[in-house]
Interface confidence: medium
C-alpha cells in the first residue's frame, strides 16, 4: 500500500485550543483500516472517518477538537497490508499559547487533500 500522511514530514504549529484535522492517504488497498499513532502509542479513535477517492485510494481522518499541550508530539498513520504494518512519515505537532499566531509549514501540494486541514 502507498501510505502518506498529507504534508509529512513537516512541523505543524497550532494555537492552543484550536481544532486540527490530519489526513492520511492510502493507495493500493480496497478497505484500509487506518490506525493513528502518537509518539508510538495507538490513538483510539472510534467512528474513524474515510473519504474514497477511488476504489483503491482512501483518505482517513484524525480530528482533534481542541489541541492542548498533551496533544503535542509526533503523529503518523499506519495500515496492515499482507500481515505487515506499513507506516507513514510523521508530522510533528507543536503548540503556541492561546491567541498567538501559529504558522503551519507544509509542502505545497495543490489538491483537496494536500495537508492536514484546520477547522475553526
Amino acid at each position: 500500500a502507498g501510505l502518506k500522511l498529507m504534508g509529512a514530514p513537516v512541523k505543524l504549529t497550532v494555537s492552543q485550543g484550536q481544532p486540527v484535522k490530519l489526513n492520511c492517504s492510502v493507495e493500493g488497498m480496497e478497505e484500509p483500516d487506518i490506525q493513528w499513532v502518537k509518539d508510538g502509542a495507538v490513538v483510539q479513535n472510534l467512528d474513524q472517518l474515510y473519504i474514497p477517492v477511488s476504489e483503491q485510494h482512501w483518505i482517513g481522518f484524525l480530528s482533534l477538537k481542541s489541541v492542548e499541550r498533551s496533544d503535542a508530539g509526533r503523529y503518523w498513520c499506519q495500515v496492515e497490508d499482507g500481515g505487515e504494518t506499513e507506516i507513514s512519515q510523521p508530522v510533528w505537532l507543536t503548540l503556541v499559547p492561546r491567541g498567538s499566531s501559529a504558522h503551519h509549514h507544509h509542502h505545497h501540494h495543490h489538491s483537496a487533500w494536500s495537508h492536514p486541514q484546520f477547522e475553526k
Epitope: 478497505e31 483500516d33 490513538v43 483510539q44 479513535n45 472510534l46 467512528d47 474513524q48 472517518l49 474515510y50 473519504i51 474514497p52 481522518f61 480530528s63 482533534l64 477538537k65 481542541s66 492542548e68 486541514q117 477547522e119
Partner: antibody
Framework: EVQLVQSGADVKKPGASLTISCQAS????????ISWVRQKPGKGLEWMGA????????YYGPSFQGHVTISADRSTATAYLQWRSLEASDTAMYYC??????????????????WGPGTLVPVSS | SYELTQPPSVSVSPGQTARITCSGD??????AYWYQQKSGQAPVLVIY???KRVSGIPERFSGSSSGTMATLTISGAQVEDEADYYC???????????FGGGTKLTVL
C-alpha cells in the same frame, strides 16, 4: 435507501444464549462502522459497543465488556450481537446503528444517523 | 467509567427557548452529538460535532459547547418538539461512546 433490518427475539430464560442480527442494505457495508445501543424499558440510551468497517476492531463500553460479543459477516452485510448467558437485566430494546465511516466531504453528518427499528429482547424465568 | 450528565427534565411554554445541558469532563476535547427520541420511535440525530445541524432539522435547533458543557438550544419550542433528548460523546481516550441520561422536554 439505507436500511438496517433487525431480527426478532422470543422470550428467553436466564442463562440462555442468544444472537440477534442486523442486516444492512442500501450502502456498502464495509464503508461504515456498526454500533449497538441498549434501551431498557422506560430508561435511557446506553452505548454498548462498535465494530469497525472491516470487522478487524471491536470496542465495548465498560458495562458490556465480557458480557456481549459484537461481530460481523461482510459477505451478508450483517452485524451480530451475541450473549453466552442472558440475565433478566438484559431485558431491553437493542438498536443497531450505522456510525462513522464514509464522508462525502469536509463535514461529517453520518454519526449515528441511521438506526435499525430495534430488537426487543425479553428475558424472564 | 465516564459519564455525561443531563437534567432529567426541562419544561417550557410554546414559543419559549428551551436549553438542555450536557456536562462531561472530556467535552473540552470530544465533540457532542444530540439525539431526539419521540415515544415509541428510534432516536434521530439533530446536532453533530457540537453545533452542526443535520440536514432537514428545523433551524430552531442549535448546539454549542464551552469547556465541560455542551448545550442544545431550541429557540421557539413547538409542541412537536416534546421528546427525550440525549447527548452523546466519546470517553477521553476515545475508545468507547457514552450517552447522557436523557432529558425529557415538555412543551405545554
Amino acid at each position: 435507501e439505507v436500511q438496517l433490518v433487525q431480527s426478532g427475539a422470543d422470550v428467553k430464560k436466564p442463562g440462555a444464549s442468544l444472537t440477534i442480527s442486523c442486516q444492512a442494505s442500501g450502502y456498502t457495508f464495509t464503508d461504515y462502522w456498526i454500533s449497538w445501543v441498549r434501551q431498557k424499558p422506560g430508561k435511557g440510551l446506553e452505548w454498548m459497543g462498535a465494530i469497525s468497517r472491516n470487522g478487524s476492531t471491536t470496542y465495548y463500553g465498560p458495562s458490556f465488556q465480557g458480557h456481549v460479543t459484537i461481530s460481523a459477516d461482510r459477505s451478508t452485510a450483517t452485524a451480530y450481537l451475541q450473549w453466552r448467558s442472558l440475565e433478566a437485566s438484559d431485558t431491553a430494546m437493542y438498536y443497531c446503528v450505522r456510525s462513522g465511516g464514509l464522508t462525502s466531504g469536509g463535514t461529517i453528518p453520518e454519526y449515528y444517523q441511521h438506526w435499525g427499528p430495534g430488537t426487543l429482547v425479553p428475558v424472564s424465568s | 467509567s465516564y459519564e455525561l450528565t443531563q437534567p432529567p427534565s426541562v419544561s417550557v411554554s410554546p414559543g419559549q427557548t428551551a436549553r438542555i445541558t450536557c456536562s462531561g469532563d472530556a467535552l473540552p476535547k470530544k465533540y457532542a452529538y444530540w439525539y431526539q427520541q419521540k415515544s415509541g420511535q428510534a432516536p434521530v440525530l439533530v446536532i453533530y460535532e457540537d453545533k452542526k445541524r443535520v440536514s432537514g432539522i428545523p433551524e430552531r435547533f442549535s448546539g454549542s459547547s464551552s469547556g465541560t458543557m455542551a448545550t442544545l438550544t431550541i429557540s421557539g419550542a413547538q409542541v412537536e418538539d416534546e421528546a427525550d433528548y440525549y447527548c452523546y460523546s466519546l470517553a477521553v481516550d476515545g475508545n468507547y461512546g457514552v450517552f447522557g441520561g436523557g432529558t425529557k422536554l415538555t412543551v405545554l
